[in-house]
């Protein structure tokens, strides 16, 4: 950089680069100002005048410092199986996520392609593995001494209460019934709820113009096939 602070536009030193929040304009052959998030380049710089920025119009955005001629369009309204967790603003795209009780059954680079309802374990079965943002609940039969009497995507098998005198023995789908007035629980406390999974963020990525080639994109996938769960049901 020159010894004194250079004001845009300026010609970079031979072999030098432009500063942060500046870009090299090939036509003007000058370092020029980028526009801040929420704005775009209305007029590109010349040798004598800097970039002129303007605010993004409604339903458009820029998330990064940029020199795009037009702001990016916000994504479509969320599908009815999704909820909007981030509104479209001038600085951020709309974010859609699978609604509560659902998970992303098919992820794509653009976000969640298909949301599916979380499996519910029927009575006699409890949650072995809770649902995540990209995987379904896995149910397992309640082991001897435990039960689940609910149809739920969060309830695990709970231990039968221990009776001084048993009126009705417990089974996989029903707690023991005691004649005693003060039954006790074996080990674990009563109802245990697993937390609902955090929904997948479905966000459209914003391309940014650059003098060099853009880096490759990548996205996360769920790990490995999971076996189908027994004892599952729907609503």
């Amino acid at each position: 950089l020159p010894a004194q602070v250079a004001f845009t536009p300026y010609a970079p030193e031979p072999g030098g680069t432009c500063r942060l929040r500046e870009y090299y304009d090939q036509t003007a052959q000058m370092c020029c100002s980028k526009c801040p998030p929420g704005q775009h380049a209305k007029v590109f710089c010349t040798k004598t005048s800097d970039t002129v920025c303007d605010s993004c119009e409604d339903s458009t955005y820029t998330q990064l410092w940029n020199w795009v001629p037009e702001c990016l369009s916000c994504g479509s309204r969320c599908s009815s199986d999704q909820v909007e967790t981030q509104a479209c603003t001038r600085e951020q795209n709309r974010i859609c996520t699978c609604r509560p009780g659902w998970y992303c059954a098919l992820s794509k680079q653009e976000g969640c392609r298909l949301c599916a309802q979380l499996r519910k374990c029927r009575p006699g079965f409890g949650v072995a593995r809770p649902g995540t943002e990209t995987s379904d609940v896995v149910c397992k039969p309640c082991a001897p001494g435990t039960f689940s009497n609910t149809t739920s995507s969060t309830d695990i098998c709970r231990p039968h209460q221990i009776c001084h005198v048993v009126a009705i023995p417990g089974n996989a789908s029903m707690d023991a019934v005691c004649t005693s007035t003060s039954p006790t629980r074996s080990m674990a406390p009563g109802a245990v709820h697993l937390p609902q999974p955090v929904s997948t963020r479905s966000q459209h990525t914003q391309p940014t113009p650059a003098p060099s080639t853009a880096p490759g994109t990548s996205f996360l996938l769920p790990v490995g096939p999971s076996p189908p769960a027994e004892g599952s049901t729907g609503d």
Epitope: G75, R77, L106, S107, C115
Partner: antibody, heavy 124, light 112 residues
């Protein structure tokens, strides 16, 4: 070429179960999903459910989800659909079809490849 | 669930004449990714269904250009510019925008 080959016709008594197979070839099985569709005699198409061949994630039609299980065997590139507690109104031709999956980066085509169909007859 | 309806349910046509099938969905089929996952399938007698059109208007490979799709949101149309004998069969619209996937009841196209 890309194809789905289904198992042969089945006859079952009410209350029994049936398991239909759908063997894929000509493409990377785990890059796609498999959808199952059935068609009762003289009727339209009914969507039964879907399985992501990569993750094993499934989603079933609500009226069938207590009786149906869809699975895949990635080692043999085969999808399976098991239907339990069969009733006479389950008599139909059952089709598997390829659908987009986690690894299908090209343009979305929809159900672009279909099996030849498996006739399941439920009769006492 | 998204309900798909089709009109007409039966369409007797003259060879060489155009045919048009309408499909309507009970709610918008525009996905949050911007795509509209509306397909048209053809099922000839005794055969499995065959994909004709995907994402409203894209002809699948090998499908003759006499087939075209149009529409947006909740209203869609399949047109056959000049019906040929091999076009006899039942035509279904279907949505794969969200679960559960749903089909229209089908439109039977036959020759007068």
């Amino acid at each position: 070429q890309v194809q789905l080959v289904q198992s042969g016709a089945e006859v079952r008594k009410p209350g029994a179960s049936v398991k239909v197979s759908c063997k894929a070839s000509g493409y990377t099985f785990t890059s796609y999903s498999v959808t199952w569709v059935r068609q009762a005699p003289g009727q339209g198409l009914e969507w039964m459910g879907w399985i992501n061949a990569f993750s094993g994630n499934t989603h079933y039609a609500q009226n069938l989800q207590d009786r149906v299980t869809m699975t895949t065997d990635t080692s043999t590139s085969t999808a399976y659909m098991e239907l339990r507690s069969l009733r006479s109104d389950d008599t139909a031709v059952y089709y598997c079809a390829r659908e987009e999956g986690s690894g299908s980066y090209e343009d979305y085509y929809g159900m672009d490849v279909w099996g030849q169909g498996t006739t399941v007859t439920v009769s006492s | 669930d998204i309900v798909m309806t089709q009109t007409p349910l039966s369409s007797p046509v003259t060879l060489g004449q155009p045919a048009s099938i309408s499909c309507r969905s009970s709610q918008s089929l525009v996905h949050s990714d911007g795509n509209t996952y509306l397909s048209w399938l053809q099922q000839r007698p005794g055969q499995p269904p065959r994909l004709l059109i995907y994402k409203i208007s894209n002809r699948f490979s090998g499908v003759p250009d006499r087939f075209s799709g149009s529409g947006a949101g909740t209203d869609f149309t399949l047109k056959i510019s000049r019906v040929e004998a091999e076009d006899v069969g039942v035509y279904y619209c279907m949505q794969t925008t969200q679960f559960p996937f749903t089909f229209g009841p089908g439109t039977k196209v036959d020759i007068k």
